[in-house]
Interface confidence: medium
């Protein structure tokens, strides 16, 4: 499955939007730093089946969408940037869903990839828990935005590697 050229443009736009959402200097939030234990191994260049990689990427973007779709994110972050981000993620998800259908034949993630998908879900659960514990403070959001920027970048790298293998 070939992801369209617009997909990588959309990835870049999503990263720019994440960067624009950050409002305060990360240096003023050093005490709030947290290790969310990003499941790096799921994004490393192990002998992924393409369908598995696409399923993991889809889960990553879907969970990102869910995280930013809450009332708490709407209250804390710039409304228009947030909406642009939703729309961008939606287009990314549409592209990946088309690919999952071609590679796997069903949209729901196959059970054989469940461990990888579960690792991504648990990662986002840790992020949500952190935000709750920190009462969705502005510094907590800065830390989370920084983390999502990093994880989103890693998922983009995986997409690039998939493309280069074609």
């Amino acid at each position: 499955c070939d992801l369209p050229q617009t997909h990588s443009l959309g990835n870049r736009r999503a990263l720019i939007l994440l960067a624009q959402m950050r409002r305060i200097s990360p240096f003023s939030c050093l005490k709030d730093r947290h290790d969310f234990e990003f499941p790096q191994e799921e994004f490393d260049d192990k002998q992924f089946q393409k369908a598995q990689a696409i399923s993991v990427l889809h889960e990553m973007i879907q969970q990102t969408f869910n995280l930013f779709s809450t009332k708490d994110s709407s209250a804390a972050l710039d409304e228009t940037l947030l909406d642009e981000f939703y729309i961008e993620l939606d287009q990314q998800l549409n592209d990946l869903e088309s690919c999952v259908m071609q590679e796997v034949g069903v949209i729901e993630s196959p059970l054989m990839y469940e461990d990888s998908i579960l690792a991504v879900r648990k990662y986002f659960q840790r992020i949500t828990l952190y935000l709750t514990e920190k009462k969705y403070s502005s510094c907590a959001w800065e830390v989370v935005l920084s983390e999502i920027y990093r994880s989103f970048s890693l998922s983009i790298n995986l997409q690039k590697r998939l493309k280069s293998k074609e």
Epitope: F65, D83, Y86, D90, L93, M101
Partner: antibody
């Protein structure tokens, strides 16, 4: 792949109600909402309402008194019901998938041509 | 509700010609929420451009969109036979209802 297939009557008597079913495949109903839009020669494309993934609904104020949108997650079906139809309700009725509030529609049903006539 | 007015209502263009159509909103719309669809006879609308200027998946690069505030436009740099269709602009923000323009029908000259 993602599909939305509509089924419903082509002809409705004046003052009767219209029921259309939108059966979807290729995506999870817990991640998406489905909007209903109609297209009539006189008024062009007109948004009627939406049922969100959680089951809550929003309706166009002009139709709120005679419109009902529901769904059955287990059957992957969305249901559209409009009461008290008049000749001016003659149109093509579409269901379309939306992920979030402001996201444009990438997938549409094939449309159901509804004629209101005695 | 926001009214979207498209002009012209009908236009014709020769193959290879540059085509521009406009969409004017009755009050300001953020560029994030302004989208364009293409519809051919007997088919459902197809997303063409989202958030004013971003091409939807699989849309040829000859299509482009621009604008802000109350004035938006869709341009085809090099008209092809398959571009003959009706084009609709669409806006949706936080307060329903979303609205669509009346459409611009593009024919081949």
């Amino acid at each position: 792949q993602v599909q939305l297939k509509q089924s419903g009557p082509g002809l409705v008597q004046p003052s009767q109600s219209l029921s259309i079913t939108c059966t979807v495949s290729g995506f999870s109903l817990t991640s998406y909402g489905v909007h209903w839009i109609r297209q009539s020669p006189g008024k062009g494309l007109e948004w009627l309402g939406v049922i969100w993934s959680g089951g809550n609904t929003d309706y166009n104020a002009a139709f709120i008194s005679r419109l009902s949108i529901t769904k059955d997650n287990s059957k992957s079906q969305f249901f559209f019901k409009m009461n008290s139809l008049q000749a001016k309700d003659t149109a093509i009725y579409y269901c379309a998938r939306g992920r979030g509030n402001y996201v444009p529609f990438t997938y549409w049903g094939q449309g159901t041509l509804v004629t209101v006539s005695a | 509700q926001i009214v979207l007015t498209q002009s012209p209502t009908i236009m014709s263009a020769s193959l290879g010609e540059r085509v521009t159509m406009t969409c004017t909103a009755s009050s300001s719309v953020s560029s994030t929420y302004l989208h364009w669809y293409q519809q051919k006879p007997g088919s459902s609308p197809k997303l063409l451009i989202y958030s004013t200027s971003n091409l939807a998946s699989g849309v040829p690069a000859r299509f482009s969109g621009s604008g802000s505030g109350t004035s938006y436009s869709l341009t085809i740099s090099n008209m092809e036979a398959e571009d003959a269709a009706t084009y609709y602009c669409h806006q949706y923000h936080r307060s329903p209802p979303m609205t669509f323009g009346g459409g611009t029908k593009l024919e081949i000259k």
